[in-house]
């Protein structure tokens, strides 16, 4: 990075006083700085010298040195003040264009940095700036007026405060430009239309531009079509408005719709789809199978897609049992629309209970008629078990009760010692019982199945478990023989526990 | 008219970080820009280096290595930060506007 | 680094006097140049820069003098406030004082 002598980052001189600015680099220096009067340069090898003998207001200003042949592209500055009592400013342009929302530096620098507390900007003529002129100042800079509008291109003048009168500097231009973005800002409404033959029509295509130059048309699978075109201006906008009305519609104007807007810029195009129908319709579906399962305990949303013209006049969500007549909350029902011909209805079911398995059914209801859409919902258990000792045919045996859904599998395993639940240690036989007799098993409901174990002698010190389970969890049930030959005791002199 | 006031502790440790701060008041520091320099006692004055509101800087080569000087311009400061000091260190600092406004000086002793 | 050298150290005047103070530099430092006033246990005051300019607010039997490596500060007729320590100061590389002229009464 070039050194710059004298070692300041801004100086303070007189009008008149000899002004030496010295630029040390590695290789070759450049000075830049405002055009001024009075400078001379020259240059020393690998030092450049930018001298005055007589400066002046105009000398007022950032002087910038580079170094051309280093990659980083360093470099150093300072700013001189020539503090000239009759002129507080030097102004470095008498115009100032910018695009709209871009900053606009009015470039008065001031002489003497003494004046910065007491500088403001005005309009010519002393008036004040426009409402809402967001503006800041800098010494070394000038003015800046922030996001610059078109409305703020004016006269501007710069003032500063000089014992106790205000000074104002020469005049500058500020120019602020449109900005034309790109191509016209479209819409075209609706975004998609159904009517059935016979009906009235209307699709409106609208363009708006912050330049009055452009163009727009609306044009049915690629014919241009003669509409007459509003104008307008509003919100700092130019707006063209072409809006076809059809007062009986056939199947001939089906189709696609195109609106189309262009500039100096560009194009651009927007498109919508236009259905006509012979009747109305009104169709159901839904992204899910329509026969659910779900863990009882855990929540379940049923979700219909609706596909209807004319609108739904009516429509809820109904329980159609077996067990009981209680009907879904209206607040668990929610209804979203995906677009005007397009709704999807949600049933909130959360934790459900026993009692809320069954059919439920979406009806809805357009001038098309009726339709309904049904789902059913099965609740999976976990087995409970439960066993018994009885005699069947004169023979002593275990009979275990499993009842869930799915349906239960059954193992029965015979173990050493008196415990809640065999281990594997412990564990003395096993059988798998594939195939156990189903005792009920209705829709809606548990399956309960029942598996025998022939017992003829019931050890002691032992117990026989049943096992149930199936793919929501697992059941068991340990029964605990008290007494020895307890297989020529009834029952009820045996100790069972779950 | 402009005033600038040194604050900071006035002992600190062999090998610490001397830790000085610089308010300004009856202008803003966002203009100009601002300078450290120090005198031990009975000696001469000795440049520090300074900083612009743009955030440039310049130090004494001497010094360069061990010196920070920053602004903060919402709280209207600038600070000075003198890693690794010795007893060399002891002085009266003052900040200065530029070199034609000076705050009072506030004496550092660098001792265990 | 630039040097920069005052002499004379002290300087015994009387009220009234013309006196001079000389500050040399090591190597030419064109006119960027300034010098202070200092008294005991307050801030240098700043008097004139780039070698001749007064600092405003600043008495006007004050003048500074020079360019390239001789400078002069001269204070015309003495008065009893201006009995202080002087200091050059140099800013065309870097920043370096001279090592001070106290002005004492005779």
């Known amino acids: 990075i070039p050194v710059i002598e004298p070692s300041v980052p801004e100086l303070v001189v007189k009008p008149g006083a000899t002004v030496t600015l010295r630029c040390v680099g590695n290789g070759s220096v450049e000075w830049d700085g405002p055009p001024s009067p009075h400078w001379t340069l020259y240059s020393d090898g690998s030092s450049s010298i930018l001298s005055t003998n007589n400066a002046t207001f105009q000398n007022t200003g950032t002087y910038r040195c580079t170094e051309p042949g280093d990659p980083l592209g360093g470099s150093a500055a300072i700013h001189l003040y020539v503090k000239d009592p009759a002129r507080p400013w030097n102004v470095l342009a008498q115009e100032v264009v910018v695009f709209e929302d871009q900053d606009a530096l009015l470039p008065c620098l001031l002489t003497d940095p003494v004046l910065e507390a007491g500088v403001s900007l005005v309009r010519v003529r002393g008036r004040p700036l426009m409402r809402h002129t967001n503006y800041s100042f800098s010494p070394w800079h000038g003015f800046t007026i922030h996001r610059a509008k078109f409305i703020q291109s004016q006269d501007y003048q710069c003032s500063a405060l000089m014992g106790g009168r205000k000074v104002m500097s020469i005049s500058i231009r500020l120019k602020v430009q449109k900005v034309i973005p790109g191509p016209p800002a479209l819409t075209l409404v609706p975004a998609e239309l159904v009517r059935i033959r016979g009906e009235a029509a209307q699709i409106v295509c609208s363009a708006s531009s912050v330049d009055v130059n452009f163009d727009v048309f609306l044009q049915h699978n690629n014919t241009k079509l003669a509409i007459p075109q509003q104008s307008d201006f509003h919100n700092n906008r130019y707006q063209k408005v072409l809006t076809l009305n059809l007062d009986q519609v056939d199947f001939q104007h089906a189709g696609n719709y195109s609106c189309v807007a262009s500039n100096v810029q560009g194009k651009h195009s927007t498109s919508m789809f236009f259905r006509v129908v012979e009747s109305a319709y009104l169709n159901l579906s839904s992204e899910q199978n329509l026969i659910q399962e779900v863990t009882v305990g855990e929540g379940l949303n049923l979700k219909v897609m609706v596909e209807a013209y004319p609108g739904l006049q009516g429509f809820n969500w109904t329980y159609l049992g077996p067990f009981s007549d209680h009907q879904p909350e209206p607040k668990l029902a929610n209804a979203t629309t995906k677009d005007t011909y397009r709704h999807t209805f949600t049933l909130s079911l959360p934790r459900l209970k026993p009692s809320e398995a069954g059919r439920y059914s979406f009806l809805a209801r357009n001038p098309g008629g009726w339709r309904a859409l049904t789902f059913e919902l099965t609740l999976r258990y976990p087995p409970e078990v439960s066993v018994i000792w009885t005699f069947i045919n004169g023979s002593g045996t275990l009979l275990c009760a499993a009842s869930g859904y799915p349906q239960p599998n059954v193992t029965w395993l015979q173990c050493s010692g008196h415990t809640d639940r065999c281990d594997e240690a412990q564990v003395l036989q096993v059988w798998d019982d594939p195939y156990p007799e189903v005792l009920s098993q209705e829709p809606f409901h548990k399956v309960t199945v029942q598996s025998l174990l022939t017992v003829e002698t019931l050890e002691h010190n032992q117990t026989y478990e049943c096992r149930a389970h199936n793919s929501v969890g697992s059941g068991s049930w340990a029964f605990i023989p008290i007494s020895a030959g307890a297989h020529t005791h009834p029952p009820d002199e045996f100790l069972f526990t779950p | 008219q402009v005033q600038l006031q040194e604050s900071g502790p006035g002992l600190v440790k062999p090998s610490e970080t001397l830790s000085l701060t610089c308010t300004v008041s009856g202008g803003s520091i966002s203009s100009s820009y601002w300078t450290w320099i120090r005198q031990p006692p009975g000696k001469g004055l000795e440049w520090i280096g300074y900083?612009?509101?743009?955030?440039?800087?310049n130090y004494n080569p001497s010094l360069k290595s061990r010196v920070t000087i920053s602004v903060d311009t919402s709280k209207n400061q600038f600070s000075l930060k003198l890693s690794s000091v010795t007893a060399a260190d002891t002085a009266v600092y003052y900040c200065?506007?530029?070199?034609?406004?000076w705050g009072q000086g506030t004496l550092v002793t660098v001792s265990s | 680094d630039i040097q920069m050298t005052q002499s004379p150290s002290t300087l015994s005047a009387s009220v009234g006097d013309r006196v001079t103070i000389t500050c040399r530099a090591s190597?030419?430092?064109?006119?960027?140049l300034a010098w202070y006033q200092q008294k005991p246990g307050k801030a240098p005051k700043l008097l004139i820069y780039?070698?001749?300019s007064l600092e405003s607010g600043v008495p006007s039997r004050f003048s500074g003098s020079g360019s390239g490596t001789e400078f002069t500060l001269t204070i015309s007729s003495l008065q009893p406030d201006d009995f202080a320590t002087y200091y050059c100061?140099?800013?065309?590389?870097?920043?370096?004082f001279g090592q001070g002229t106290k002005v004492e009464i005779k």
């Open positions: 780039m070698a001749s």
């Open positions: 200065a506007r530029g070199f034609d406004y």
């Open positions: 900083i612009h509101y743009s955030g440039s800087t």
């Open positions: 190597q030419s430092i064109s006119s960027w």
């Open positions: 100061q140099q800013y065309n590389s870097y920043w370096t």
